[in-house]
Interface confidence: medium
């Protein structure tokens, strides 16, 4: 099964996110690069590069990590940088692109789920105060047994992709994150152009699966009021 995203044009009046992920008040889930807003009926991106400031990897997109833009640079100035591909040097897992992890300073494939489960944290699904408001948003928790999900399965609250079962990634869902399916061939994907169009992402897709890349669908005839589709395609 696949997941949809409430994404389209940027709008100016969407309030900022809550201070933390559900169940993790200390974990900031904030605006990330290449993000879309709920809005009109087109998917818009910006070609020019706009560095997005960050404090931790979780604030960046699935294909980015948070670091100082220059080696030995000011630690207080960090931005979201493009992830490192296979065989590139790394210092931690988040630096490597989806489908890879950092081993002995090099990004290597995680095809066989080498490190899945290495960072298994207990996800406590508690949402703090029942009526919490921050920065223009109100979040009210509801209590329904059918909303409970087993940890690691599709729809489970997560902090990072290693919290999710095989074939799933940890992607934003409102101001939390949940496990969603990694995209398969032919499925629509989100293509960020040079990480432009920064804003608040409330719904986020997973990345394309192993051996696939996100490219414009060649046979997609662009109708009025619709965007050019990007789909996961074989390399």
């Amino acid at each position: 099964t696949l997941n949809s995203v409430l994404n389209s044009n940027a709008i100016k009046n969407l309030p900022p996110p809550l201070g933390g992920a559900a169940g993790h008040p200390g974990s900031a889930v904030s605006a990330a690069p290449g993000i879309l807003y709920p809005g009109g009926n087109k998917y818009q991106t910006i070609d020019n590069y706009q560095p997005y400031p960050c404090a931790e990897d979780e604030e960046c997109g699935t294909d980015e990590y948070c670091a100082s833009p220059t080696r030995g640079g000011d630690a207080g100035v960090q931005i979201c940088l493009a992830c490192r591909k296979r065989r590139k040097r790394c210092m931690r897992h988040a630096m490597c692109c989806p489908g890879n992890y950092c081993k002995n300073g090099i990004c290597v494939s995680s095809d066989q789920n080498h490190f899945r489960g290495e960072i298994e944290e207990t996800i406590t699904e508690s949402f703090g105060n029942d009526h919490s408001t921050l920065d223009g948003y109100s979040r009210r928790t509801t209590l329904s047994s059918k909303m409970y999900h087993t940890k690691g399965q599709e729809g489970s609250v997560c902090l990072r992709s290693s919290d999710c079962a095989s074939g799933l990634c940890c992607a934003r869902h409102f101001w939390s994150k949940i496990c969603k399916p990694v995209l398969k061939e032919g499925q629509v994907c989100t293509k960020h152009r040079r990480k432009g169009s920064h804003g608040l992402e409330i719904f986020q897709r997973c990345y394309c699966g192993e051996g696939l890349s996100c490219r414009i669908q060649k046979d997609h005839h662009q109708a009025s009021n619709s965007s050019r589709l990007h789909t996961c395609q074989r390399h």
Partner: nanobody, 124 residues
Amino acid sequence: EVQLVESGGGLVQPGGSLRLSCAASGNIDRLYAMGWFRQAPGKEREFVAAISWSVSSTYYADSVKGRFTISADNSKNTAYLQMNSLKPEDTAVYYCAAEGGYSGTYYYTGDFDWGQGTLVTVSS
């Protein structure tokens, strides 16, 4: 493709109430969330409220908090927006959107046209 059909709009006096409905149909396996947005004449579309089954929460814009209540029937793929104590500034076309597990292609609301929306006019 997924269709979202909104209904329940109309003309109401300030202080009055309306209940909007949004029915999602198409290749839907399950819904993670449904939400409402609105667009007043000459303004950008804005978030109003949403409900998430995955993180067991409802979300509201400050401008409607305490007056609007979002609910949903997951088995019917339908969301509702109960609007009380309506104000003239609530006048807008109200649109529905959904996040979920869809069979076939992976859709987001930019991949297909929004529904026509339902017009809410608050005026005396």
